[in-house]
């Protein structure tokens, strides 16, 4: 996973994850690997 973007200097890329298994289905429209939520109850 890219942690930095090289522009005029190094800028921290604040990574967000699909952290909770229950979010996998509900976040299919999001950019998987970049966003996360809390536990989603079906």
């Amino acid at each position: 996973d890219a942690e930095f973007r090289h522009d005029s200097g190094y800028e921290v890329h604040h990574q967000k994850l699909v952290f909770f298994a229950e979010d996998v289905g509900s976040n299919k429209g999001a950019i998987i690997g970049l966003m996360v939520g809390g536990v989603v109850i079906a």
């Epitope: 967000k16 994850l17 229950e22 976040n27 966003m35 996360v36 536990v39 989603v40 109850i41």
Partner: antibody, heavy 112, light 112 residues
Amino acid sequence: EVQLVESGGGLVQPGGSLKLSCAASGFTFSSYGMSWVRQTPDKRLELVASINSNGGSTYYPDSVKGRFTISRDNAKNTLYLQMSSLKSEDTAMYYCASGDYWGQGSTLTVSS
Amino acid sequence: DVVMTQTPLSLPVSLGDQASISCRSSQSLVYSNGDTYLHWYLQKPGQSPKLLIYRVSNRFSGVPDRFSGSGSGTDFTLKISRVEAEDLGVYFCSQSTHVPWTFGGGTKLEIK
């Protein structure tokens, strides 16, 4: 930058009520579920409430069911935890969390 | 609920040593999509937990490569190849495969 900032903690007498708030920024709050996790004085972590992205579904463990209510206002990017009938065993640091990011915590002390 | 059991409770190390922490779950953490939602946090004194490793072996943003995670099914390990002073604190494993989100009891990494 992702930020979760809790507020509303304090000292409450047994049987009392308190409402915690968590202001979220740096991500699309309305798209994701959120949780409240508490850390007891012995440093153990316990999930106390979760809510899905639109607020339509919630989860509570038996230890707080019927006493705690989680809610959210997606227009204000804010998560809430309403706590009532508080007991001494609810004394803890309460964290707003999205899995990979946690707030700084809000302290609840239940004591007479 | 899935019970997460961490060992040891306390881990005294010398700076520069390798450290290893074990975490076992009461049931398999493999989700239906094949991924395993086992994570590691570090909590330093006076701070909230910070994510180190997600989904068994992936380092979170900014986490040094001296941290590595491994394991499968119900048996997982966090290794720190060369312990530095900034690594001291309490390490928690956590699972988010099953509802509710649950946590290990913590392992305190301290100077020998």
